[in-house]
Interface confidence: low
Amino acid sequence: EEELQMIQPEKLLLVAVGESATLNCTVTSLLPVGPVLWFRGVGPGRELIYNQKEGHFPRVTTVSDLTKRNNMDFSIRISSITPADAGTYYCVKFRKGSPENVEFKSGPGTEMALRAKPSAPVVSGPAARATPEHTVSFTCKSHGFSPRDITLKWFKNGNELSDFQTNVDPAGQSVSYSIRSTARVVLAPWDVRSQVTCEVAHVTLQGDPLRGTANLSEAIRVPPTLEVTQQPMRAGNQVNITYQVRNFYPQNLQLTWLENGNVCRTETASTLTENKDGTYNWTSWLLVNTSDQRDDVVLTCQVKHDGQLAVNKSLVLEVSAHQKDQSSDATH
């Protein structure tokens, strides 16, 4: 006689909450005589899911007519799936016996797992700003999805990035999974207006991926370029010193004027002009009266940008020999 095989073709069944699940089971022989029962789990604590002979199973229906003489299909359908239904389901053949039927053979089991969408990806940037040509890391996290296979891509201004590392946890079997990916981005001076996007594709999303974004403006510091010029005023003994601070980001900037090492004015950047790339320019003026100067004046402008070390730019105002003479005369 042909040896009985219990065939459960699906190793894994993915079902969303509220859906129906069909658990397939066919047998290859009608012998030995006896019923086929469905259980969830194994061992003494297993739960009876369906018994064709007795019991009340309101959410379970059979796929085919079990009363037919030559029926070999013992598949069942469970309606209104809830998270409590997750587990491994076994169809089990019993041999007719006395006083009780005896378990004869079990199918390999079908794991029913919930299908769940990933959460909206959350992208976080580095803890501290970095300057252009440095590399910063962005992290993307999404959780709560099942099954485990998921595709994650990174984009910068719509262009796909390749330098990233992705991990899906846990490695073993689980009800749901989480993904964490870290992308490395090399900053460019024009990245103030740039954006990185993390895109997550999953079987539950039906081809409509979820996206999370972060602005590089939160991660970049563009240090200023400094330019100092002097213009004599028509008044004669006055010089206008112009200090131009260009292409910096963020706005947080403090400027201190020093005359021969002594602080003469401190100001915080307020009226800024914004460049197309998102960086800022700022101009500061200092009017210096040279009429009462006996020696050359060293004017230093000290710029402190976004909490970084101050950058100095100095200019020597040369006092003419005639002025020096007048000055010395006045002191005698």
Epitope: K11, E111, D149, I150, T166, P170, A171, G172, Q173
Partner: antibody, heavy 126, light 113 residues
């Protein structure tokens, strides 16, 4: 019957790179993770990493981070493992192995390895 | 990483006798939500790739003779060959696949006495 067929033996100089291929036949190529495991002469087995041919996702052992790259060509059902900056201690037989993925349908589950390639001997010598 | 330690390193058993190989993991490989041990056993013959014998600590792979059996849970596992045959001479490895990276034992060489 699933078969994993690997490329032939290679001899490389220290500092060079080697790229080993693993061609799958007789099964659904994209439904299972392909892992790479190496075995130095007379030594045990050491896992290097995995790739899901469907999504292109990879996971590498910390030891090989930065030196190993796994890629795939879905048109030929082939997965590749490239190891760079070779040193003499990289001399080993390199195996590709398919995940058993008992409870996973084309997902990246870590699992036992049910099908193995025949192995590719990579010798690193100056 | 989980460290897998096998004992003994080598073993000589007479034909028809029972062979027992032990494997211990540095942490539990039992996953509580499905009550499964993420442990496999492999057989490797000279010049061949490893062959999967047992997974989930005790489930025999299709086509593996029933003289091979696996037992144990948590951190301590055993591979038993009930009646050694000449073709069973090989190196046997245990492997955990509970967490990344999957790790193997150092191997146990089984010979005929």
């Amino acid at each position: 019957q699933v078969q994993l067929v690997q490329s032939g033996a290679e001899v490389k100089k220290p500092g060079a790179s080697v790229k080993v291929s693993c061609k799958a036949s007789g099964g659904t190529f994209s439904s299972y993770d392909i892992n790479w495991v190496r075995q130095a002469p007379g030594q045990g087995l050491e896992w290097m990493g995995w790739m899901n041919p469907n999504s292109g996702n990879t996971g590498y052992a910390q030891k090989f981070q930065g030196r190993v790259t796994m890629t795939r060509d879905t048109s030929t059902s082939t997965v590749y493992m490239e190891l760079s900056s070779l040193r003499s201690e990289d001399t080993a037989v390199y195996y590709c192995a398919r995940d058993l993925t008992l409870y996973c349908s084309s997902t990246s589950c870590l699992d036992a390895f049910d099908y193995w390639g025949q192995g590719t001997l990579v010798t690193v010598s100056s | 990483d989980i460290v897998m330690t096998q004992s003994p390193d080598s073993l000589a058993v007479s034909l028809g006798e029972r062979a027992t190989i032990n494997c211990r993991s540095s942490q539990s490989v039992l996953y509580s939500s499905n009550n499964k041990n993420y442990l496999a056993w492999y057989q490797q013959k000279p010049g061949q790739p490893p062959k999967l014998l047992i997974y989930w600590a005790s489930t025999r792979e299709s086509g593996v003779p029933d003289r091979f059996s696996g037992s144990g849970s948590g951190t301590d596992f055993t591979l038993t060959i009930s009646s050694l045959q000449a073709e069973d001479v090989a190196v046997y490895y245990c492997q955990q696949y509970y967490s990344t990276p999957p790790t193997f034992g150092q191997g146990t060489k089984l010979e005929i006495k």
